[in-house]
């Protein structure tokens, strides 16, 4: 995701609402924020190929698969 979400997330949660029905092929980059002292909510911000940043539902099945793959990959390397 672009810098805007990351900078904002330094201070507070960034996702007031999430966008449904985004095709994975439209996404150029994903940023997943775990909970922290400034926000007790898991948030996923997607940068789209058209330059927009949107928030996605962390519970979306395709996202959970992507995140699980990343986590599994990380565990194998450790």
């Amino acid at each position: 995701a672009g810098p805007a979400a990351a900078v904002l997330r330094e201070l507070r949660c960034v996702c007031l609402q999430t966008t449904q029905g985004v095709h994975p092929k439209m996404i150029s980059n994903l940023q997943v924020f775990a909970i922290g002292p400034q926000c007790s909510k898991v948030e996923v911000v997607a940068s789209l190929k058209n330059g927009k940043e949107i928030c996605l539902d962390p519970e979306a099945p395709f996202l959970k698969k992507v995140i699980q793959k990343i986590l599994d990959g990380g565990n194998k390397e450790n």
Epitope: L11, R12, C13, C15, L16, A34, I35, P37, Q38, C39, S40, K41, V42, P58, E59, L71
Partner: antibody, heavy 118, light 109 residues
Framework: EVQLQQSGPELEKPGASVKISCKAS????????MNWVRQSNGKSLEWIGN????????SYNQKFQDKATLTVDKSSSTAYMQLKNLTSEDSAVYFC???????????WGQGTLVTVSA | QAVVTQESALTTSPGETVTLTCRSS?????????ANWVQEKPDHLFTGLIG???NRAPGVPARFSGSLIGDKAALTITGAQTEDEAIYFC????????FGGGTKLTVLQ
């Protein structure tokens, strides 16, 4: 409506362990972290730690690192805190608290009184 | 560990503006301390009011506002009401959340 329902009061002997629960409803359980806080002598609050159910990650206040163990059961949307090797100093009311978009401690359970006495 | 200090008690009257403060033993409170304010009413009824210094929680009346005043975090109640009588705790983030001792606010009729 967000609700956090905690288990009932506990009376334990020194050296024992106790596990208290916090059943969440009215929201997507795995997306929000669950904090645990204790109130001793009816006044001061201490943050024990929190559990991130999405990534299954715990963060502890160092003071409670060897005292408390935080877990969750995602299937029942329930958070648990186990306290071990209890002493009289652990006698307190223990709370679970969930955040909102704006604040870490938005919604609180009703509290669970733990009394440690020989 | 850092110590967070609050006024032990304050008294105000309905309609008045009152400010509660939260001081850090480590120096000036900043936005990186993510000041939270929590209200406690009798029977262990806790409600989160403010997070991230100045973000009001859902359903909290607009008369409650959070800010930094000088080197402290502050909770201001503009036009206090009798139902605002409660204990108010602030919490500051260091490497964990540290709560102050609480301010007992009395709203005298």
């Amino acid at each position: 409506e967000v609700q956090l329902q905690q288990s009932g009061p506990e009376l334990e002997k020194p050296g024992a362990s106790v596990k208290i629960s916090c059943k969440a409803s009215g929201y997507s359980f795995t997306v929000y972290g669950m904090n645990w806080v204790r109130q001793s002598n009816g006044k001061s609050l201490e943050w024990i730690g929190n559990f991130d159910p999405y990534f299954s990650v715990t963060s502890y206040n160092q003071k409670f690192q060897d005292k408390a163990t935080l877990t969750v059961d995602k299937s029942s949307s329930t958070a648990y805190m186990q306290l071990k090797n209890l002493t009289s100093e652990d006698s307190a009311v223990y709370f679970c608290a969930r955040g909102s978009w704006e604040t870490i401690f938005a919604y609180w359970g009703q509290g669970t009184l733990v009394t440690v006495s020989a | 560990q850092a110590v967070v200090t609050q006024e032990s008690a304050l008294t105000t009257s309905p309609g008045e503006t009152v400010t509660l403060t939260c001081r850090s033993s480590t120096g000036a409170v900043t936005t990186s301390n993510y000041a939270n304010w929590v209200q406690e009413k009798p029977d262990h009824l806790f409600t989160g009011l403010i997070g991230g210094t100045n973000n009001r929680a859902p359903g909290v009346p607009a008369r409650f506002s959070g800010s930094l005043i000088g080197d402290k975090a502050a909770l201001t109640i503009t036009g206090a009401q009798t139902e605002d009588e409660a204990i108010y705790f602030c919490a500051l983030w260091y490497s964990n959340h540290v709560f102050g001792g609480g301010t007992k606010l009395t709203v005298l009729q």
